[in-house]
C-alpha cells in the first residue's frame, strides 16, 4: 500500500532539462526505477534512471536536448510517471501530468564578478543560465550577503523585483571579506520556485585611506 | 472551495458489477490526477489507480487487474471506476483523490480527497 509516504516532485529549467526526485519510505533499496517523459503534442520520449540522494529518496535530470534548446512550451503537457522493475516488468509508481511553465526553476545564476568595489561600496554582476527567451524581463532576483562572523541563514535577502543582473552593496565595512550569492525565479507559474544559489564569490572591501575616519 | 463526491457505491452480489463516480469541484483541474484508494475494515487505506488529464493511467494492482478499469471525462471534472466481477475481498470504502501527481503528491502539494463510498460485495 501507498499511505502518502511517497513524493514525486519535478521542475523544468525552461530550455531542455526536467530535474525530478522521487522518494519513498521503505522501497527497496536495490531496486531499478527510472523516469519517463511522455508528451502529449511532441513525437519524442525520454527516460532517465533515477539514481539514489539519499536513504529513501531518488533523483534524475531528464535532458531533452542542447541546453539551450526550447524544447517545450507553455501548451505542452508532459506525463511523468516513475516506474520500477519488479520482475521481468516495469511498474507504474506514480503519474502526474506535467506543465512545464508552470513547474519552473531556473539553474542558479553563473558568471559572478566584482565590477568595482570600495571602502563601503562593491558593485557585482552576473548572468542567467539556460533561461528562456519567452520570459523577456519577466524575472526577479533575490540576493545575500555573507559578513564575517553570520552565517548565510542569517543574512537578509535583498529583492530584485525586475530583471536586473547587478547589485550595488551599500554600508559595508572597510578591508573586510565578504561572500555574496544570487538566485532568481520567472514570475510565470503556479508551481514555480527559486533557483539554487550561485556559487558564492568572495570579495574584500579596500582599506580606509590612513587618517581618515571610517 | 474543492469538493469530490463520490457515487456508484452499494451491495452487489459476488460476480456483479459496480460504477463508481467521482465529480470533482472548486479548481482547475487539468494540472491534477484523479484517481482511487481504497480501505478494507481493519485495513489501511492502498492505491488502487489513478488517471491524468491527458488519459494515462497508472497499472492496476494484481489484485484486481483485468476486473477494474478507469476513465475520466474532462468535460464534467469526472473520473470513473468500472468494477467487474467483484469478490468478496473487494468489500471497501473507495475514496476518491486528486492531487498533482498520483498516488504520491510533489512537495507543498495538497490532496483532496473525497468522503468515501462503501462498497460491499456479499458472497
Known amino acids: 500500500a501507498v499511505n502518502g509516504t511517497s513524493q514525486f516532485t519535478c521542475f523544468y529549467n525552461s530550455r531542455a532539462n526536467i530535474s525530478c526526485v522521487w522518494s519513498q519510505d521503505g522501497a527497496l533499496q536495490d531496486t531499478s526505477c527510472q523516469v519517463h517523459a511522455w508528451p502529449d503534442r511532441r513525437r519524442w520520449n525520454q527516460t532517465c534512471e533515477l539514481l539514489p540522494v539519499s536513504q529513501a529518496s531518488w533523483a534524475c535530470n531528464l535532458i531533452l536536448g542542447a541546453p539551450d534548446s526550447q524544447k517545450l512550451t507553455t501548451v505542452d503537457i508532459v506525463t511523468l510517471r516513475v516506474l520500477c522493475r519488479e520482475g521481468v516488468r516495469w511498474r507504474v509508481m506514480a503519474i502526474q501530468d506535467f506543465k512545464p511553465f508552470e513547474n519552473l526553476r531556473l539553474m542558479a545564476p553563473i558568471s559572478l564578478q566584482v565590477v568595482h568595489v570600495e571602502t563601503h561600496r562593491c558593485n557585482i554582476s552576473w548572468e542567467i543560465s539556460q533561461a528562456s527567451h519567452y520570459f523577456e524581463r519577466h524575472l526577479e532576483f533575490e540576493a545575500r550577503t555573507l559578513s564575517p562572523g553570520h552565517t548565510w541563514e542569517e543574512a537578509p535577502l535583498l529583492t530584485l523585483k525586475q530583471k536586473q543582473e547587478w547589485i550595488c552593496l551599500e554600508t559595508l565595512t572597510p578591508d573586510t571579506q565578504y561572500e555574496f550569492q544570487v538566485r532568481v525565479k520567472p514570475l510565470q507559474g503556479e508551481f514555480t520556485t527559486w533557483s539554487p544559489w550561485s556559487q558564492p564569490l568572495a570579495f574584500r572591501t579596500k582599506p580606509a585611506a590612513l587618517g581618515k575616519d571610517t | 472551495e474543492v469538493q469530490l463526491v463520490e457515487s456508484g457505491g452499494g451491495l452487489v452480489q459476488a460476480g456483479g458489477s459496480l460504477r463508481l463516480s467521482c465529480a470533482a469541484s472548486?479548481?482547475?483541474?487539468?494540472?491534477?490526477?484523479m484517481g482511487w484508494f481504497r480501505q478494507a475494515p481493519g485495513k489501511e487505506r492502498e492505491f488502487v489507480v489513478a488517471i491524468t488529464w491527458t488519459k494515462r493511467s497508472t497499472d492496476f494492482p494484481d489484485s484486481v487487474k483485468g476486473r477494474f478499469t478507469i476513465s475520466r471525462d474532462n468535460a464534467k471534472n469526472t473520473v470513473y471506476l468500472d468494477m467487474n466481477s467483484l469478490k468478496p475481498e473487494d468489500t471497501a470504502v473507495y475514496y476518491c483523490?486528486?492531487?498533482?501527481?498520483?498516488?504520491?503528491?510533489?512537495?507543498?502539494?495538497?490532496?483532496?480527497w473525497g468522503e468515501g463510498t462503501l462498497v460491499t460485495v456479499s458472497s
Open positions: 472548486g479548481r482547475d483541474f487539468s494540472s491534477y490526477a
Open positions: 483523490a486528486s492531487a498533482r501527481g498520483l498516488p504520491v503528491t510533489p512537495l507543498g502539494d495538497i490532496i483532496y
